[in-house]
């Protein structure tokens, strides 16, 4: 129907419009993780606060056990924004000694599971190596794109190491998704 | 109506559609600041411009000291890019010394300011430690979600250190929300 | 029509509503890229996967010869993130014997080419210096924002260094558009 | 759920060194750092540093560094607190704990009581 | 190290009572402030993280606030099973750091 005025009465046959505050649309912020038991060879997923401070699902976007569940087909941006912070030594001194006490790097995957299929697909990784110089490192992860998704699909933030997430603020640490 | 054709004219009752054209939308980019004023304990705000080049307002968000107003209530898609850029030694050695010609960090937020609510809130925030050895640095910090704003509501995009934006060109750092 | 139900079928003037489904949109992503020819002063422009895997351009946005070309005209959200990786020594050493072994910076740019308009717009900027104290390092810049575009308006990603573009995985490098 | 489960009390002399044990059960044990924190006697809390299970990196509070040593043995989910050259004023409560990241404590362990006398 | 001071050492109050517990950092610790409950012959219990985010089944009552230096814990209506020691934690940077402690005893 680009730039069409619509057709009179008579003309019986529409596109299928809708109203955009009817679409699916989901606000997620961090909360502080639980530890967990992790999946060999898998990044763990991170869950998320759904209804409180500036979290909201709406128009049957659900959140349930760290997945956002597509509810209805179609092309979604999704985004995901997460803060790591550490403490570190001399990265050098770390690498020159061989000394393994911190991360060589943060990573951040928005990985979308659907069930008819066996391996969960990777849609958006952020990853960075870490080599801080000063004592106290903190930075954050931003990813975000378009992907057509079906009904049904599910939807989680994973990340290379949880114990170095930012939880402490819902403005540093979030994962949303809506319907275009 | 998702996903349901209209219905033949008869039937009078119809979902508030609206052409996307005619929705709020606005991309601020980045000029050269005032020293101005700042309150105790609060990040100084950025002022932008809103009609050069690739900035524009339309549909009535206005853009007025400062602000974003927002001019109707629904979920908007916020963002900005703010361009740091510094001089510094080697961070180690500014430690030590405790000399201060240097922030530990540099840190974005994208903040809603809503008249009957006497408290700020912050949206967004992007924050990074700042521990360079070269003598030279830059990097963004990007940010971008989804929030439900009402009507009234104003955004400003805050920063932890006005002196250390690079304001020197409009793709570098700018500021943008539009009402999906 | 904003909050407006829509008017009886004997009112023959409408906005111009159209289907979300209708609108032009694309999200490519990385393949490796073969070595060409780069103007001067002109940083390379990527080449992209646009149908297989997560790739895909709809509704009349098409994709050649690294350009995604607007077939309408209107509010587009812009996105892209590059995954740079890299090889270096100690930071201080490469600036003081002044060997040029690695970049002072990354950068990543979404132009604008208009054929009427004599030289190419750049849309946004990322940029940041890379320092890095360890041998490996690897980072993404992402960007997105709003832009208005006319109908053949092209658009393209350049970056400041093309054998530092981690091309292995779709999920690491990318760059789509959609018409809100 | 997430236990930590620590060995029995000990009594040492002054100049002796202790090792207390500490068995995670409900979670994945090199996720998550394991710090050690002590309580003397009728005082407050003070932290003596931390392990990575994964890589076994450790962060020390100065104050105990050269006499705390932290190891563990991921094929039994154990974490390992050893202290040398016992006083009588390391008379504590010590407490493994975890959490989520690494400077909270949300579980901990049941406390061992180390008396060091003469 | 960061130095962190509560006050009082102890308190006094009844069941019922609204009661504030301050802690001071020696240097800034952003929001990175941790709260924990201690009853005689147990472990600490985790309360708050972040200066004011609730940890999971902590009951509403128990509040945090502050950033930079200054914090604060608030019982807004004391129930009997809140008497015991409360303790503040920087979580800022290492070494990790806890308050001395304040002590809340029934008047």
């Known amino acids: 129907l680009k730039g069409q005025e619509f057709a009179p009465s008579h003309q019986q046959v529409y596109a299928p419009l809708r109203a955009d505050g009817d679409k699916p649309r989901a606000h997620l912020t961090v909360v502080r993780q639980t530890p967990t038991q992790h999946f060999k060879n898998q990044f763990p997923a991170l869950h998320w606060e759904h209804e409180l401070g500036l979290a909201f699902t709406k128009n049957r976007m659900n959140y349930t056990n760290k997945f956002l569940l597509i509810p209805e087909s179609g092309d979604y941006f999704i985004y995901s924004q997460v803060t790591f912070r550490g403490m570190t030594s001399e990265c050098s001194e770390i690498r020159q000694a061989g000394r393994p006490n911190k991360p060589d790097s943060i990573t951040v995957v928005i990985t979308k599971v659907t069930d008819s299929y066996p391996e969960p697909t990777q849609l958006l990784m952020g990853t960075k190596s870490v080599c801080e110089v000063g004592s106290n490192w903190f930075q954050p992860i931003y990813l975000g794109a378009m992907f057509s998704l079906q009904e049904g699909d599910k939807l989680m933030v994973n990340v290379s190491d949880i114990s170095l997430v930012d939880y402490t603020k819902e403005d540093k640490t979030f994962f949303g998704a809506f319907l275009l | 109506l998702k996903g349901q054709e209209f219905a033949p004219s008869h039937q009078q009752v119809y979902a508030p559609l609206r052409a996307d054209g005619d929705k709020p939308r606005a991309h601020l980019t980045v000029v050269r600041q005032t020293p101005t004023q700042h309150f105790k304990n609060q990040f100084p705000a950025l002022h932008w411009e809103h009609e050069l080049g690739l900035a524009f307002t339309k549909n009535r968000m206005n853009y007025t000291n400062k602000f974003l107003l927002i001019p109707e209530s629904g979920d908007y898609f916020i963002y900005s890019q703010v361009t740091f850029r510094g001089m510094t030694s080697e961070c180690s050695e500014i430690r030590q010394a405790g000399r201060p010609n240097k922030p530990d960090s540099i840190t974005v937020v994208i903040t809603k300011v809503t008249d009957s609510y006497p408290e700020p809130t912050q949206l967004l925030m992007g924050t990074k430690s700042v521990c360079e050895v070269g003598s030279n640095w830059f990097q963004p910090i990007y940010l971008g979600a989804m929030f439900s704003l009402q009507e009234g509501d104003k955004l400003m995009v805050n920063v932890s250190d006005i002196s250390l934006v690079d304001y020197t060109k409009e793709d570098k750092t700018f500021f943008g929300a539009f009402l999906l | 029509l904003k909050g407006q139900e829509f008017a009886p079928s004997h009112q023959q003037v409408y906005a111009p509503l159209r289907a979300d489904g209708d609108k032009p949109r694309a999200h490519l992503t990385v393949v490796r890229q073969t070595p060409t020819q780069h103007f001067k002063n002109q940083f390379p422009a990527l080449h992209w996967e646009h149908e297989l895997g997560l790739a895909f351009t709809k509704n009349r946005m098409n994709y050649t010869n690294k350009f995604l070309l607007i077939p309408e005209s209107g509010d587009y959200f812009i996105y892209s993130q590059v995954t740079f990786r890299g090889m270096t020594s100690e930071c201080s050493e490469i600036r003081q014997a002044g060997r040029p072994n690695k970049p002072d910076s990354i950068t990543v740019v979404i132009t604008k080419v208009t054929d009427s308009y004599p030289e190419p717009t750049q849309l946004l900027m990322g940029t940041k210096s890379v320092c890095e104290v360890g041998s490996n390092w690897f980072q993404p810049i992402y960007l997105g924002a709003m832009f208005s575009l006319q109908e053949g308006d092209k658009l393209m990603v350049n970056v400041s260094d093309i054998s530092l573009v981690d091309y292995t995985k779709e999920d690491k490098t990318f760059f789509g558009a959609f018409l809100l | 759920q997430v236990q930590l489960v620590q060995s029995g009390a000990e009594v040492k002399k002054p100049g002796a060194s202790v090792q207390v044990s500490c068995k995670a059960s409900?979670?994945?044990?090199?996720?998550?750092?394991m710090h050690w924190i002590r309580q003397a006697p009728g005082q407050g809390l003070e932290w003596l540093g931390w392990?990575?299970?994964?890589?076994?990196?450790?962060n020390y509070a100065q104050k105990f560094q050269g006499r705390v040593t932290m190891t563990r043995d991921t094929s039994i989910s154990t974490a390992y607190m050893e202290l040398s050259r016992l006083r009588s004023d390391d008379t504590a409560v010590y407490y493994c704990a975890t959490g989520s990241s690494w400077e909270g404590f949300d579980y901990w362990g049941q406390g061992t009581l180390v008396t060091v006398s003469s | 190290d960061i130095q962190m001071t509560q006050s009082p050492s102890s308190l006094s109050a009844s069941v019922g009572d609204r009661v504030t517990i301050t802690c001071r950092a020696s240097q800034s610790i952003s929001s990175y402030l941790n709260w924990y409950q201690q009853k005689p012959g147990t472990a600490p219990k985790f309360l708050i993280y972040?200066?004011?985010r609730l940890q999971s089944g902590v009951p509403s009552r128990f509040s945090g606030s502050g950033s930079g230096t200054d914090f604060t814990l608030t019982i807004s209506s004391l129930q009997p099973e809140d008497f015991a020691t409360y303790y503040c934690q920087q979580s800022d940077t290492t070494p990790i750091t806890f308050g001395q402690g304040t002590r809340l005893e029934i008047k």
């Open positions: 392990i990575i299970p994964n890589s076994g990196g450790t």
């Open positions: 972040g200066a004011s």
């Open positions: 409900g979670y994945t044990f090199t996720g998550y750092y």
